[in-house]
């Protein structure tokens, strides 16, 4: 039910990467506007994106309050210029989103190799610890702060002159690997959350190769 000149939102979809979280929906509004509400299972509804003509709403500020909570959102449809109007049941038309648990479901963003340093036959590869919008004590937490040992990085590395790859893993942001002296190597990393069953892996980082500016070589 609802007013004759509004349609309910549909295809409500959470888009979330490294906890930056946006709710998207359809359709593009024609003579109507939307308001979004979000709550935890046990909490009160909080309104966001009031009377918007957009079909997305950034809910990051709400979900980062507790990324382990499960959230539900709903999108209300109102006639443009008459937002007091309600449906025949005395309430505006709305549609519920799927449930969303940020800690379990946010996509892992593409990681970045921050640096690599060769010392003799060892190379230390460091992965950038990306800052998230999750806060604790007024400080933004990094991805490692949020996930702790539940975040693993997988390193792929190979000689520039060969196609045979090797791999290593770390639950910190640093790798220390053995290399052959005098050989240049290329590196790529991938983030993984082992405890998950979906959205477990990030895309691969851009490839970085020795002999380029990110690295440093020291003969010891």
């Amino acid at each position: 039910s609802g007013t004759t000149n509004t349609v309910a939102a549909y295809n409500l979809t959470w888009k979330s990467t490294n906890f930056k979280t946006i709710l998207e929906w359809e359709p593009k509004p024609v003579n109507q506007v939307y308001t979004v509400q979000i709550s935890t299972k046990s909490g009160d509804w909080k309104s966001k994106c009031f009377y918007t003509t957009d079909t997305e709403c950034d809910l990051t500020d709400e979900i980062v309050k507790d990324v382990k909570q499960t959230y539900l959102a709903r999108v209300f449809s109102y006639p443009a210029g008459n937002v007091e109007s309600t449906g025949s049941a005395g309430e505006p038309l709305y549609e519920n989103s799927p449930e969303f648990t940020p800690y379990l479901e946010t996509n892992l963003g593409q990681p970045t190799i921050q640096s690599f340093e060769q010392v003799g036959t060892k190379v230390n590869v460091t992965v950038e610890d990306e800052r998230t919008l999750v806060r604790r004590n007024n400080t933004f937490l990094s991805l490692r702060d949020v996930f702790g040992k539940d975040l693993i990085y997988t390193l792929y590395y190979w000689k520039s002159s060969s196609s045979g790859k090797k791999t290593a893993k770390t639950n910190t942001n640093e790798f220390l690997i053995d290399v052959d002296k005098g050989e240049n190597y290329c590196f790529s990393v991938q983030a993984v959350i082992p405890s998950r069953t979906v959205n477990r892996k990030s895309t691969d980082s851009p490839v970085e190769c020795m002999g380029q500016e990110k690295g440093e070589f020291r003969e010891i």
Partner: antibody
Framework: QVQLVESGGGVVQPGRSLRLSCKAS????????MHWVRQACGKGLEWIGL????????IYDPKFQGRFTISADNSKNTLFLQMDSLRPEDTAVYYC??????????WGQGTPVTVSS | DIQMTQSPSSLSASVGDRVTITCKAS??????LNWYQQKPGKAPKLLIY???SLADGVPSRFSGSGSGTDYTFTISSLQPEDIATYYC?????????FGQGTKLEIT
């Protein structure tokens, strides 16, 4: 529930090729790293290699590089092991396994391969 | 490549005994070590991961310890159903390597 079922094993002559399959159910292989491991009769376990089915990255034990090829068909949720130039010492039971990054949590039942003339 | 030296290769013990198996890595594997149990004709079964963590559904008589290059697997009180071959596996870097295995028998 999660299940891995290998197939394609059998008796093959030295120098010939064989392709093993590992059909996964209960999860998407592209969400995990997938491995092949083998075990000769009465011997220990031997790691062959892994694939990330999402991007096709493969890693092999150097002793198998060039002769064995791991691939995946995500649409069929199936892992493959192509074995070329087979030798009698490749006679073994071949297992596929799922890797959650801290451990191999599910294994297939194994498929036996015998290389003999 | 990392070599894993597992000992002993075989072991005979009585029901109720405490049983210990060791794996020594040729370099630091940063606790990326698992212990598996394998019974004849069956696939390996995970017992311990990340050197010390007990896998789901595994009895508490099984435990693991160690870090760096030296790792230990212990059965605190051997049961008849523990008769099997046990393997360690390092997966910190490729090529992943298994220990040679320890065949456990009951006297």
């Amino acid at each position: 529930q999660v299940q891995l079922v290998e197939s394609g094993g059998g008796v093959v002559q030295p120098g010939r090729s064989l392709r093993l399959s590992c059909k996964a159910s209960g999860f998407n292989i592209k969400d995990y790293y997938m491995h092949w491991v083998r075990q000769a009769c009465g011997k220990g376990l031997e790691w062959i290699g892994l694939i990330d089915p999402e991007n096709g990255n493969t890693i092999y034990d150097p002793k198998f590089q060039g002769r064995f090829t791991i691939s995946a068909d995500n649409s069929k949720n199936t892992l493959f092991l192509q074995m070329d130039s087979l030798r009698p010492e490749d006679t073994a039971v071949y297992y596929c396994a799922r890797d959650n990054s801290y451990y191999f949590d599910y294994w297939g039942q194994g498929t036996p391969v015998t290389v003999s003339s | 490549d990392i070599q894993m030296t597992q000992s002993p290769s075989s072991l005979s013990a009585s029901v109720g005994d405490r049983v210990t198996i060791t794996c020594k890595a040729s370099q630091d594997i940063r606790k990326y070590l698992n212990w598996y149990q394998q019974k004849p004709g069956k696939a390996p079964k995970l017992l311990i991961y990340y050197a010390t963590s007990l896998a789901d559904g595994v009895p508490s008589r099984f435990s693991g310890s160690g870090s760096g290059t030296d790792y230990t697997f212990t059965i605190s009180s051997l049961q008849p159903e523990d008769i099997a071959t046990y393997y360690c596996l390092q997966h910190g870097e490729s090529p992943y390597t298994f220990g040679q295995g320890t065949k456990l028998e009951i006297t």
